[in-house]
Interface confidence: low
Amino acid sequence: GITIPRNPGCPNSEDKNFPRTVMVNLNIHNRNTNTNPKRSSDYYNRSTSPWNLHRNEDPERYPSVIWEAKCRHLGCINADGNVDYHMNSVPIQQEILVLRREPPHCPNSFRLEKILVSVGCTCVTPIVHHVA
Amino acid sequence: GITIPRNPGCPNSEDKNFPRTVMVNLNIHNRNTNTNPKRSSDYYNRSTSPWNLHRNEDPERYPSVIWEAKCRHLGCINADGNVDYHMNSVPIQQEILVLRREPPHCPNSFRLEKILVSVGCTCVTPIVHHVA
């Protein structure tokens, strides 16, 4: 792969071993403006696999608020507006990075943590298991 | 709100103002094990709004690899396996936190960044605009 030379203006790092502690500027550079998923789109209501959004709050985590999607139905909404159980509503999940305060309650010391969140739901054809 | 007392074992922080720099341990605590979205489920193929997953790589970002979903079709797959133009495949997007090397190429100095990623696709009823 390509080796990019280290910037001479980098801060010093005392510990070069893993696990390593790094400096992180919490002044977020935000490429987007909308943080409330309900305002960003109404897909959660218009989808054939609609979902509700639940607020998950944890003061020991950064960001402290995460929105979790929960599918409304086991099946999917058909053209008549009824639930079709030949299809399944399933959550689309994604692993995201969060910062966990460590030691607990510390304002300036964190550990990276990966968590799995449900972002929305999609309608899938079920896997039918045939018994021999 | 509840005020949680500061842990006396916290590292010292010189700058209490925002933007503030914090210490982050990069030894990730992972509550999940599967990081390849294609292995985690086959929803992207079984969905009525199927999508392809594209690998987005950036060595100046942590994590350096992010998977982006792109909807395969304008419409959704109907019961016949054909594309139904009365419905629309749309991407479900989520804001996630990543670490951006700052200054560039520094191994131990980062800035938090919010980016918008498409996680998967869902099938929605289109908004029909009626002309008066």
Epitope: - | E68, L74, N78, N82, Y85, S89, P126
Partner: antibody
Framework: EVQLLESGGGLVQPGGSLRLSCAAS????????MSWVRQAPGKGLEWVSA????????YYADSVKGRFTISRDNSKNTLYLQMNSLRAEDTAVYYC???????????WGQGTMVTVSS | NFMLTQPHSVSESPGKTVTISCTRS????????VQWYQQRPGSAPTIVIF?????PSGVPDRFSGSIDSSSNSASLTISRLKTEDEADYYC?????????FGGGTKLTVL
């Protein structure tokens, strides 16, 4: 080899009607969505309409909605475009295309000319 | 509805490289695939790039496509230009409710 052959074009007066056909061969016709795309003389391409493989779902550009009807006969491997209330601005070469919207195949016919003039 | 804007014309000499841009007026270009079509005079369009950067079989590797999310634009690059590349080139994309073509770019190989 995929082949698409349009027919039915010609000269028609404003307010008149015309029916275009597209005979398809070289692929399983019923498995593919089909589209009509037009090109006015000396102008660019404009998407007109599309239909799902089964024929159950249709989709139209705003400029033709309510005037044009897309349909297909899978037993005859033929795509149709019924054009009513024709206007001078509908004058164009009309192309039939397979699976155009996603561009994975993007096969096009050679086109048929429709002229709306008094 | 959104628009796709292309330069009206570009020209370059044989053997050189030319790039044609396609800018989306609203909505993220990155969310939906971009296609590129070549149309020679008197002929029907043929697809040269689909899904942003994929080449159909039979299209030379001199043709390549790319996306720049920061400028909300797509590009078609043709390297080692040949006289037979002289044609009109159209970009195409879509949104949840419409399919749109760019206005086309006339490529002249000098």
């Amino acid at each position: 080899e995929v082949q698409l052959l349009e027919s039915g074009g010609g000269l028609v007066q404003p307010g008149g009607s015309l029916r275009l056909s597209c005979a398809a061969s070289g692929f399983t016709f019923s498995s593919y969505a089909m589209s009509w795309v037009r090109q006015a003389p000396g102008k660019g391409l404009e998407w007109v309409s599309a239909i799902s493989g089964s024929g159950g779902s249709t989709y139209y550009a705003d400029s033709v909605k309510g005037r044009f009807t897309i349909s297909r006969d899978n037993s005859k491997n033929t795509l149709y475009l019924q054009m009513n209330s024709l206007r001078a601005e509908d004058t164009a070469v009309y192309y039939c295309a397979r699976d155009l919207i996603w561009g994975v195949a993007g096969s096009w016919g050679q086109g048929t000319m429709v002229t709306v003039s008094s | 509805n959104f628009m796709l804007t292309q330069p009206h014309s570009v020209s370059e000499s044989p053997g050189k490289t030319v790039t044609i841009s396609c800018t989306r007026s609203s909505g993220s270009l990155a969310n939906y695939y971009v296609q590129w079509y070549q149309q020679r005079p008197g002929s029907a369009p043929t697809i040269v790039i689909f899904a942003n950067n994929q080449r159909p079989s039979g299209v030379p590797d001199r043709f390549s496509g790319s996306i720049d999310s920061s400028s909300n634009s797509a590009s078609l690059t043709i390297s080692r230009l040949k006289t037979e590349d002289e044609a009109d080139y159209y970009c195409q994309s879509y949104s949840p409710t419409s399919v749109v073509f760019g206005g086309g770019t006339k490529l002249t190989v000098l």
